[in-house]
Interface confidence: low
Amino acid sequence: EGVAAALTPERLLEWQDKGIFVIQSESLKKCIQAGKSVLTLENCKQANKHMLWKWVSNHGLFNIGGSGCLGLNFSAPEQPLSLYECDSTLVSLRWRCNRKMITGPLQYSVQVAHDNTVVASRKYIHKWISYGSGGGDICEYLHKDLHTIKGNTHGMPCMFPFQYNHQWHHECTREGREDDLLWCATTSRYERDEKWGFCPDPTSAEVGCDTIWEKDLNSHICYQFNLLSSLSWSEAHSSCQMQGGTLLSITDETEENFIREHMSSKTVEVWMGLNQLDEHAGWQWSDGTPLNYLNWSPEVNFEPFVEDHCGTFSSFMPSAWRSRDCESTLPYICKKYLNHIDHEIVEGGHHHHHH
């Protein structure tokens, strides 16, 4: 993460792709830099890690170089703003982004004092933009929860930043794992709580089925059984997509029986990719599989305009498919088709047909 002194547009775009940005005053054209004790406005072209910011969990604003979060000290709110430990309970660390303003509690917003220090004040409105993005709004980079897989916290979202091995991590890491899998802590201090999970890893799609996927040897399909998680349909859908997969689609009885066997010890209802999120389109699989095989529970209402628009699978019922409100939180199963290169890696060149 070493940042060169020269802030090239290309480098800036790379950071922005990771949700890391430089905060520039719209009117003063200078950028916020975190110093040892105060934040100041400096020339944006003199870039360094202390000018890089990222929205993190719980509405935090994390400074990459200072490894701390922007905090408002209630006992001296008009004092220059400073960085604090991101799980500090002594200050307010929550900031809202609204129409280019950064607002904290009690109508305090981030402003600039006459001496170019950054302060919190209720007096004026100061607008902030993302430097190098053509006047783009820093609100574009707001933190989105990243739900974990496996681990020991039942799909809880990553806590960013989290402290591990004396370092604050603002993204998932492979550090400390011999298997090189991406992981994060789900509380702010890993060593204290040891709460963690794997992160959805887009690069795992290139590798095939790693240890968090289970392979059906007859079909070159991998499945991931997240039976202890509790996510909404769209969260589950995103989690699968981020790993190069999709929510479960069931193409025939053979596949359904494979899923059933893997869930045999669990009385659990899980999300699958079946949905009618488009209120006119009827039910469809999220991965585009034609809806040729059906195993609806008898009580499902087939009106296209019913409230329940997402589909579930219950291994303990013979007619296993039901419709549910998509905001319900349930376990889920992901599915991933291996490509031909993966086939050769996994099977030594022996190809099988899909079901």
Epitope: D278, H280, G282, F302
Partner: antibody, heavy 115, light 107 residues
Framework: QVQLVQSGGGVVQPGNSLRLSCVAS????????IHWVRQAPGKGLEWVAV????????YYADSVKGRFTISRDNSKNTLYLQMNSLRAEDTAVYYC????????WGQGTLVTVSS | DIQMTQSPSSLSASVGDRVTITCRAS??????LAWYQQKPGKVPRLLIF???TLQSGVPSRFSGSGSGTDFTLTISSLQPEDVATYYC?????????FGPGTKVDIK
């Protein structure tokens, strides 16, 4: 009110290409599946293609598979049909239509494939 | 793929007559069936969806019934403005096939 305004039709020679557009207004475009349907002169309605609300699912009639491509740009509220390797039998009025059962249709645009 | 057939292909009836058009799917499609009316030179108009639900603004003389493979569109009392071609369409899964149409005119 819901409006679907089509453009891009015309006369084209067999083997050539054409792109139809359909601009939507009056509803949240990004929440709806949109279809292309065509009608040859004096004939019935023929379903051509469909694209899901987010563009991830696309299906085609066998008669156009491999030659036509449906796409959408939700930021522009616009649906497209790219028609390649056109044949005389593709001559028809092409309609864009919203939804699964489709209450809202474009005004239609005539595509004539003729040498 | 599921095929859709309609009968009759055309019919003539008097004003005030009860008119019935049938549509058959080659495999079950639950109630995922719509009926459309198209007048010459006009855009198709949705009459009924989910086999029996009347689209808003459609006169109550139109009704639909059926489920699975066999469906019916009924016009309880034919009016001059009902002269048109009527199409059924399945929307259970792609392809979203239309029936070949039934042309209705006045004797």
């Amino acid at each position: 009110q819901v409006q679907l305004v089509q453009s891009g039709g015309g006369v084209v020679q067999p083997g050539n290409s054409l792109r139809l557009s359909c601009v939507a207004s009056g509803f949240t475009f990004s929440r709806y599946t949109i279809h292309w349907v065509r009608q040859a002169p004096g004939k019935g309605l023929e379903w051509v293609a469909v694209i899901s609300y987010d563009g991830s699912n696309k299906y085609y009639a066998d008669s156009v598979k491999g030659r036509f491509t449906i796409s959408r740009d939700n930021s522009k509220n616009t649906l497209y049909l790219q028609m390649n390797s056109l044949r005389a039998e593709d001559t028809a009025v092409y309609y864009c239509a919203r939804g699964g059962p489709t209450p809202d249709w474009g005004q239609g645009t005539l595509v004539t494939v003729s040498s | 793929d599921i095929q859709m057939t309609q009968s009759p292909s055309s019919l003539s009836a008097s004003v005030g007559d009860r008119v019935t058009i049938t549509c058959r799917a080659s495999q079950g499609i639950r109630n995922y069936l719509a009926w459309y009316q198209q007048k010459p030179g006009k855009v198709p108009r949705l009459l009924i969806f989910a086999a029996s639900t009347l689209q808003s603004g459609v006169p109550s003389r139109f009704s639909g019934s059926g489920s699975g493979t066999d469906f019916t569109l009924t016009i309880s009392s034919l009016q001059p403005e009902d002269v048109a071609t009527y199409y059924c369409q399945k929307y259970y899964s792609a392809p979203f096939t239309f029936g070949p149409g039934t042309k209705v005119d006045i004797k």
